[in-house]
């Protein structure tokens, strides 16, 4: 017998969670990230929308722009110049695809206290920045590039053949932007502004994605989007510099491709900027297991960029994919030619290389069955970086520092023991020569920002400590979690359960698995998140679970590449195995299990609840990749190589969602999506509802108008009812 | 509330030089970026210079090999050394912080350059 808790007064004024909490974003956290301008020195967006300077060495901070000069242009971001004396405010912000937005510019004279008049920016841009050093201004208008000596002046325009859907200068095409860099911008400043790099994308010859936008008008515009699909045509992008003193001079130099890359489709996947005369291009063949490093340097004689072979760096997996989700970039050291880089080592784990001469000189610096994950700053003396190392947990991220100035080198975890219950999952922002840094925390507790000393890592202040969030939850009940791991035939699953409150061993209850498991992803984090999952474990009683199986990132290769050229199988075997551990544990009410996933997780969603195996009772799928030959190239290619009979055409049939329509039958099915999804889309579930209505299959749908892959507004709040009262009526829950 | 107090303007031949002075009082000094700044008649204020707490310098284009900024954290002091002087070179100086707080300015220190 356990004693009652009827009479406990502060367990009465406990409540669980609503779903009107959950899509109010009233259990919402805040975190803090400086915009660093100097190493002691950042700016930050006051509550009542000032733009203060702070000083972390005075203590001191001062107003360098009112809030009332930002809501005399409506601006809701801006940008100071490295000289100081300018800012841009941007206003009209209109999204555009994932990174992508157009915005109107202002240019704000600090030392006088008014806008720049004359020679004022064309609108809407699509991309603005600032020189590193003093004010030029390089953007981009209608897909040309142009520069501006001075705010003030009139511009200078580098390039004339930009043309929508069709050839783009400095900023990415649709899937350069979604898959490859993945950024807005497509051009670099070289480190004291003398050069600017940019990339030109050709779509001529990509197939075009159309579908309807219905907004008010009497007949539907139709959004084209230039979108390379699996084998299709792809992009053909080159690299140009320009010398930003003299830009009429020569005009733009391309540099030269590697010629083991141009021998057939290639991409472009990053640039990195080492000198103002050194410059390091990365390039990966269309096929993505080979990438090479190139750096290339300026010839003042010829005012060329001479790459030469010997400094080309061959980066090449042979069990799968070049690289985790991306390649890594590389993070150049002090003499400008050598470099550290996050890389398979010999027993298939990603860890910190040094590379001074050839890769396969390349020293390692970390290594351990765990991996490193960023590397955020080199100094002259110091590494600091990211990883999953202690304690064994993947899902967690701590920041070490590395002594790189010593031999042997000393590493020294500065996050591990700093608030060990409620901090394990960190990232970090530096200041210039990693003076200050800032340290922000995401869980598994309430997160918290803060500021520390660069040199003796000692805390100096609280940036955000969500208060605010601290005392509302105060009367909350609050699911449980748990984060363990299931070792099954040599393959370790790591999951996370989330419990009602009161939960009970000894009872049965509703198990909901929730899924992304594409590849190089991870859903089990020790991050804090108050989200509908919450809700549904705090107030409907539910289990959920999410697990990470194969193909899934930062347990070393074995695990990730396991699904190379073979999507949706082991994913949704790992899955099912899980359900049934979790069935095993003795508390799951088995004839009540469910399934859901977004996206890549709506495919895997799908696919588990058309296995055969009767475990699922229902599921839902949003916005699913129902067929690989349907989503774009640079992903899909790199997991599963080309949709072609000579390589892997077969299993891009045979994992399609419709091959499946016939096993829907015995399971109750949700399909939702968006019908001006970009991304994955709407033809991925019409392709879906057309198999099922064929098979004769009963199902239910939802369309959202006009909405994109991220179901956002007004579309968010029906979306989590709708699938609310589906789970509810599939788990017997009264309303 | 601070205090900037710029000194040693004048009237100097072209070719000729000068040495500008800023002392600040009422905060701390030596961690903050400082800059110099000029306004020629009927027109806007532009930056000149500035030097970081690191004492890593910026130049205008206009004044980059003639001037150099210098800082001494130990009398709360700014200094602008202006060599080769233009009669472009006329305006009143002004020292900040940079960037400058909103709306405040010292009174400045007239350098006039003849010809």
């Known amino acids: 017998l356990r004693p009652s808790r009827v009479h406990n007064s502060e367990e009465n004024t406990m409540r669980a969670l609503t779903l009107k909490d959950i899509l109010n974003g009233t259990f919402s956290y805040k975190t803090f990230f400086p915009n660093w301008i100097s190493g002691q020195e950042y700016l930050h967006q006051s509550a009542d929308n000032n733009i203060v300077l702070y000083n972390i060495e005075t203590g001191q901070s001062y107003t360098i722009l009112s809030n009332r000069t930002m809501k005399s242009v409506n601006a809701s971001n801006y940008g100071l110049s490295p000289d100081r004396q300018f800012v841009y405010l941007e206003s009209d912000y209109s999204k555009l695809w994932r990174y992508s937005y157009t915005a109107t510019y202002y240019i704000y004279d600090l030392s006088n206290g008014e806008f720049v008049r004359g020679n004022e920016l064309p609108r809407p841009i699509q991309y603005l920045c600032w020189s590193p050093v003093g004010s030029k201004l390089a953007y981009v208008y209608q897909n040309n590039i142009y520069l501006k000596q001075r705010p003030g002046d009139p511009p200078f325009q580098i390039t004339f053949n930009g043309r929508e859907n069709k050839i783009f200068n400095g900023i990415p095409d649709w899937v350069y932007e979604e898959e490859m860099l993945p950024t807005k911008y497509a051009l670099w400043w070289s480190p004291n502004g003398k050069f600017l790099a940019y990339a030109e994308f050709n779509d001529k010859d990509i197939p075009v994605i159309a579908y309807s936008y219905y907004g008010d008008e009497q007949y539907p515009r139709t959004i084209n989007i230039p979108y390379p699909k699996a084998g299709a045509k792809n992009p053909v992008v080159r690299i140009f510099i320009i010398d930003t003193t003299y830009p009429a001079y020569v005009g733009p130099q391309e540099v030269p491709v590697p010629a083991m890359i141009a021998s057939s489709d290639y991409y472009f996947s990053w640039l990195t900027w080492v000198t103002d005369e050194r410059v390091c291009l990365q390039w990966l063949k269309r096929v993505q297991n080979v990438s090479v490093l190139s750096i290339c340097d300026f010839r003042e004689d010829w005012q060329t960029w001479d790459c030469p072979k010997t400094q080309e760096h061959i980066e090449e997996s042979r069990t799968g994919w070049a690289g985790g989700f991306f390649v890594s970039r590389p993070v150049f050291s002090y003499d400008a030619i050598s470099y550290y880089k996050i890389f398979s080592d010999k027993d298939g784990y990603k860890h910190i290389h040094y590379i001074k001469d050839t890769v396969e000189n390349a020293i390692q610096i970390t290594s351990g069955k765990w991996e490193a994950i960023n590397i955020f700053r080199v100094t002259q003396d110091s590494l600091f970086y990211s990883s999953n190392e202690f304690e064994e947990y993947p899902g967690r991220r701590n920041i070490y520092r590395i002594s790189i100035g010593s031999y042997p080198p000393s590493k020294k975890c500065v996050t591990c023991h700093l608030r060990k219950e409620r901090c394990q999952y960190y990232t970090a922002s530096f200041s210039d020569y990693a003076k200050y840094y800032a340290l922000v925390c995401y869980g598994p507790g309430i997160p918290i920002s803060t500021l520390h000393d660069g040199r003796t890592d000692q805390e100096i202040k609280i940036l955000e400590e969500n208060k605010e969030l601290e005392n509302a939850l105060k009367n909350i009940q609050l699911p449980k979690e748990e984060i363990k791991k299931l070792e099954v035939d040599e393959i370790t699953l790591w999951y996370k359960m989330i419990l009602p409150p009161q939960f009970d061993r000894s009872k049965k209850y509703p198990l909901l698995i929730q899924v992304y498991g594409g590849p190089c992803s991870q859903s089990v984090r020790s991050v804090f998140a108050v989200n509908w999952i919450s809700y549904l474990a705090s107030k409907e009683g539910m289990v959920i679970a999410l697990v990470d199986g194969r193909g899934t990132a930062f347990q070393g290769d074995k695990l990730l590449y396991a699904v190379y050229r073979k999507l949706g199988v082991y994913e949704v075997e790992d899955q099912i195995t899980a359900v049934r551990k979790f069935i095993e544990m003795g508390f799951i009410d088995e004839k009540r299990i469910a399934i859901w996933g977004w996206s890549y997780g709506g495919y895997v969603s799908s696919l588990a609840l058309a296995s055969g195996t009767g475990l699922f009772k229902c599921g839902i799928a949003v916005a699913p990749v129902s067929s690989w030959e349907y989503y774009a190239s640079v992903y899909t290619e790199r997991f599963m190589g080309l949709p072609t009979k000579d390589d892997n055409l077969e299993h891009y049939k045979n994992s399609t969602v419709m091959a499946r329509a016939e096993y829907f039958r015995n399971v109750d099915y949700l399909l939702i999506h968006g019908t001006a999804d970009d991304n994955v889309h709407f033809q991925n579930s019409a392709q879906i509802a057309k198999a099922l209505v064929n098979a004769q299959v009963d199902f239910q749908a939802m369309w959202y108008s006009d909405q994109n892959h991220g179901l956002s507004g007004l579309s968010t709040n029906h979306l989590y009812t709708h699938m609310t009262h589906f789970l509810k009526q599939c788990f017997s829950l009264s309303d | 509330q601070v205090q900037l107090q710029e000194s040693g303007g004048g009237l100097v031949q072209a070719g000729g030089s000068l040495r500008l002075s800023c002392a600040v009082s009422?905060?701390?000094?030596?961690?903050?970026?400082m800059g110099w700044y000029r306004q020629a008649p009927g027109k806007r204020r532009e930056l000149v210079a500035t030097i970081l707490s690191s004492g890593s310098t910026n130049y205008a284009d206009s004044v980059k090999g003639r001037f150099t900024i210098s800082r001494d954290d130990g009398k709360n002091t700014v200094y602008l050394q202006m060599n080769s002087l233009k009669p472009d070179d006329t305006a009143v100086y002004y020292c900040?912080?940079?960037?400058?707080?909103?709306?405040?300015w010292g009174q400045g220190t007239q350098v006039t350059v003849s010809s």
């Open positions: 900040n912080f940079a960037p400058p707080p909103e709306g405040y």
């Open positions: 009422g905060r701390l000094f030596s961690a903050n970026t």
